[in-house]
């Protein structure tokens, strides 16, 4: 598609005259009829099969013909044609004398000619005009011509169309042969696809438009090369999508196990040092005079019952002071100036004479002790409790009360990690002492067989275009999921180009 | 225990400002990437900014880019969220979550409210 | 944007009922789905991630299932606790895009 434009310059007819010889009346008004049809090696009448156009009256006798000629006529004049030009053509210009306003060929007397030109020859498409003169014995014609492309329309024949566009379909302007020349920022047959932001990930990122990078899912960061942990991971971090592995002191699956309870919480008070003794549990070994799980308590002097034999203690500033009862002196009444017969035994204690009846020794029953039998027994000062378990008296006997993570008499058992059931998808759990382990069915990895993984569908690469590819753990085959403008079960077709 | 807990959030005329933080705790904050998603009254949910962990990249949704800045102090334990030229449709409640633009948001916060309006 | 439609928006089921809420998504999501559920005043709560897995501490009645762009949350027997707004979001494509909700009341 494209225009044969004729640009009508000068015409000359001095004496005024038509064809025929005779002399218009009063001057020869003219305009010219353009004809423009296939080549011909001999012009001959006939259809105009190229186009025709005719113009105005242009002027008197001679007169130079204007760009854009007023009166409602164009110049250059226009012959638009709809089909791949042929490289060739045949053109006839006539001027004609029009005695009244009516200029249709029925209305013109066949002797108003004054004059007709027909040339032939080849014509390649170009912005350059050609310039001609046609000379006869009375008029002389100037004027240039050239053929141009339509717009949207390029190549030597203007049979190319181009539409540059900016859209969702493409992002380019037409070269002079008609090619697509991408905008900048784009790539591909049509310009659709973005060129993605310098050093963005090949498999992990993609992007939407030029310089961007975004990540696919499981990836972070400015080039998509950087992976975001587990969701449930509390204090790791990943090496690939989903890992949680743990930071230093945090252990279990999702590293939300405190194995350095001491750094982290400092639970021991006093100047206590602290002892890191599993998850979550720890133990506090107090400085002289303090108490406690965590050594919160300050310890009286006299909260170890130093006094012997029913002795009460003073607490002072430098210590104690232990008052003896009658029969009992030392620093912690431990002599005694008693015998049996002062019946010096509680708690239905039987009395034996020592040394010729010089002193005595008291056998107590269960619970009691002491040299008098005076003492309850304190069955948790042996410290039986593990794991940090907590001591308590209940009456003959004692319990413990254990620390998150323990159980049994003595809080000397882990807790299972298995009891919840942690695997998913299937994987049998083991119960370690680092915390548990699960063993994963086929197509499942991860801490807790919680991540799918390919069996092996993918390893051939089958999808192409950067495609990413999955398998579809129903049927071990792989599923492409194409990036944007492509199709296909690998994603091997461009969109808008199906398979051939 | 993961707690995120959101702060800034009042009534704010039309074209003004807001700076809205959230403090986290119960995670090594530093490891993962955070973001802020709205809930105007009555309505869905919807993504507004993201920030990475590994180099501090962002992303916005449209309506609020150049209006709104995500940004993170991880020695703070702290994500904020700064926006300005405020308008109507911007009122909602501003939830701070764990999470990035292409992963769940696995914790999120109790929520601040804003609202714009003359 | 990647458009979520839920359906129904809104539902009256008992307890111990069945539920089922469906999420579709207007182009290919592969499993990149998550499911939330929001209680009034409330924030929204993880449920579901990568379409099945459920997050931690959530009971086994819950559970998801689907791919590409038709997905399913299953609430096997129905508790007076799940009576809430239920959401789902993609994170496949950006920006992430969430679903308008279902609301699941009392009947």
């Known amino acids: 598609s494209g225009v044969f434009q004729l640009q009508l310059q000068e015409f000359v007819n001095e004496r005024g005259v038509l064809a025929s010889g005779r002399p218009c009346e009063p001057g020869c008004r003219t305009f010219f009829r353009v004809c423009l049809k296939h080549f011909q090696a001999v012009v001959s009448p006939g259809p105009c099969t190229f186009g025709s156009v005719s113009t105005p009256v242009l002027g008197t006798n001679s007169f130079a013909v204007r760009d854009d000629s007023s009166g409602g006529g164009r110049n250059p004049l226009q012959l638009p044609f709809n089909f791949t030009w042929p490289g060739t053509f045949s053109l006839i210009i006539e001027a004609w004398h029009a005695p009244g306003d009516d200029l249709r060929p029925e209305a013109l007397p066949p002797d108003a000619l004054i004059s007709k030109i027909a040339i032939q020859g080849s014509l390649a498409v170009g912005q350059n005009w050609l310039l001609d003169e046609q000379t006869s014995t009375l008029t002389r014609l100037r004027y240039s011509y050239r053929v141009i492309c339509s717009d949207n329309y390029y190549g030597d024949n203007c049979s190319r169309l181009c539409k540059k566009r900016n859209d969702h379909f493409g992002h380019y302007v037409c070269q002079p042969d008609g090619n697509l020349s991408c905008l900048p920022g784009w790539t591909g047959e049509y310009c659709q696809q973005p060129i993605c932001l310098s050093g963005c990930h090949e498999q992990n990122g993609y992007c939407s438009k030029p310089a961007e990078c975004l990540c696919r899912p499981g990836w972070q960061g400015r080039l998509c090369n950087e992976c975001i942990p587990h969701n449930g991971c509390r204090h790791g971090t990943c090496s690939t999508p989903w890992q949680c592995t743990c930071d230093e002191g945090w252990g279990g699956l999702f590293c939300d196990q405190d194995l350095n309870y001491c750094t982290h919480h400092s639970p021991c008070k006093n100047g206590a040092t602290c002892s890191n003794s599993g998850q979550r549990s720890y133990t506090c070994t107090c400085r002289p005079g303090y108490t406690g799980v965590d050594c919160e308590l300050e310890l009286s002097e006299c909260d170890s019952n130093p006094c012997r034999n029913g002795g009460s203690c003073k607490d002072q500033e430098d210590g104690y002071h232990c008052l003896c009862p009658p029969g009992y002196y030392g620093l912690h009444c431990e002599h005694s100036t008693l015998s049996c017969a002062d019946s010096p035994c509680f708690n239905g204690g039987s009395c034996r004479e020592r040394n010729q009846g010089a002193s005595y020794a008291c056998e107590c029953p269960p619970n009691f002790t002491g040299s008098n039998c005076e003492k309850k027994v304190d069955r948790c000062t042996s410290n039986p409790c593990a794991n940090g378990g907590q001591c308590l008296n209940r009456g003959p006997s004692r319990m413990c009360r254990c620390r998150p993570g323990f159980t049994g008499t003595y809080c000397e058992r882990h807790v299972s990690d298995c009891a919840r059931n942690p695997c998913a998808h299937g994987g049998t759990c083991h119960d370690l002492e680092s915390g548990l382990m699960c063993t994963c069915p086929a197509g499942f990895s991860g801490r807790r067989c919680e991540v799918r993984t390919s069996i092996d569908a993918c390893a051939s690469s089958p999808c192409f275009n950067r495609a990413t590819c999955y398998t579809d753990l129903s049927t071990d085959t792989f599923v492409c999921n194409c990036p944007y403008g492509f199709v296909g079960s690998r994603c091997e077709f461009p969109v808008g180009l199906p398979p051939s | 225990e993961v707690q995120l807990v959101e702060s800034g959030g009042g009534l704010v005329q039309p074209g003004g400002s807001l700076r809205l933080s959230c403090a986290a705790s119960?995670?090594?904050?530093?490891?993962?990437?955070m973001a802020w998603v709205r809930q105007a009254p009555g309505k869905g949910l919807e993504w507004v900014a993201t920030?990475?962990?590994?180099?501090?990249?962002?992303y916005y949704r449209d309506s609020v880019k150049g209006r709104f800045t995500i940004s993170r102090d991880n020695a703070k334990n702290s994500l904020y969220l700064q926006m300005n030229s405020l308008r109507a449709e911007d009122t909602a409640v501003y939830y701070c979550a764990r999470g990035y633009y292409n992963s769940p948001f696995a914790y999120w916060g109790q929520g601040t409210l804003v609202t714009v309006s003359s | 944007d990647i458009q979520m439609t839920q359906s129904p928006s809104s539902l009256s089921a008992s307890v111990g009922d069945r539920v089922t809420i469906t999420c579709r998504a207007s182009?290919?999501?592969?499993?990149?789905l998550a499911w939330y559920q929001q209680k009034p005043g409330k924030s929204p709560k993880l449920l579901i991630f990568?379409?099945?897995s459920l997050a931690d501490g959530v009971p086994s009645r819950f559970s998801g299932s689907g791919s590409g762009t038709d997905f399913t949350l299953t609430i096997s027997s129905l508790q007076p606790e799940d009576f809430a707004t239920y959401f789902c979001?993609?994170?496949?494509?950006?920006?992430?895009?969430f679903g308008q909700g279902t609301k699941l009341e009392i009947k």
């Open positions: 920030i990475s962990s590994s180099d501090g990249t962002t």
């Open positions: 119960g995670f090594t904050f530093s490891n993962f990437p």
């Open positions: 979001q993609q994170y496949d494509w950006y920006p992430p895009t």
């Open positions: 182009q290919d999501i592969y499993y990149n």
């Open positions: 990568d379409t099945s």
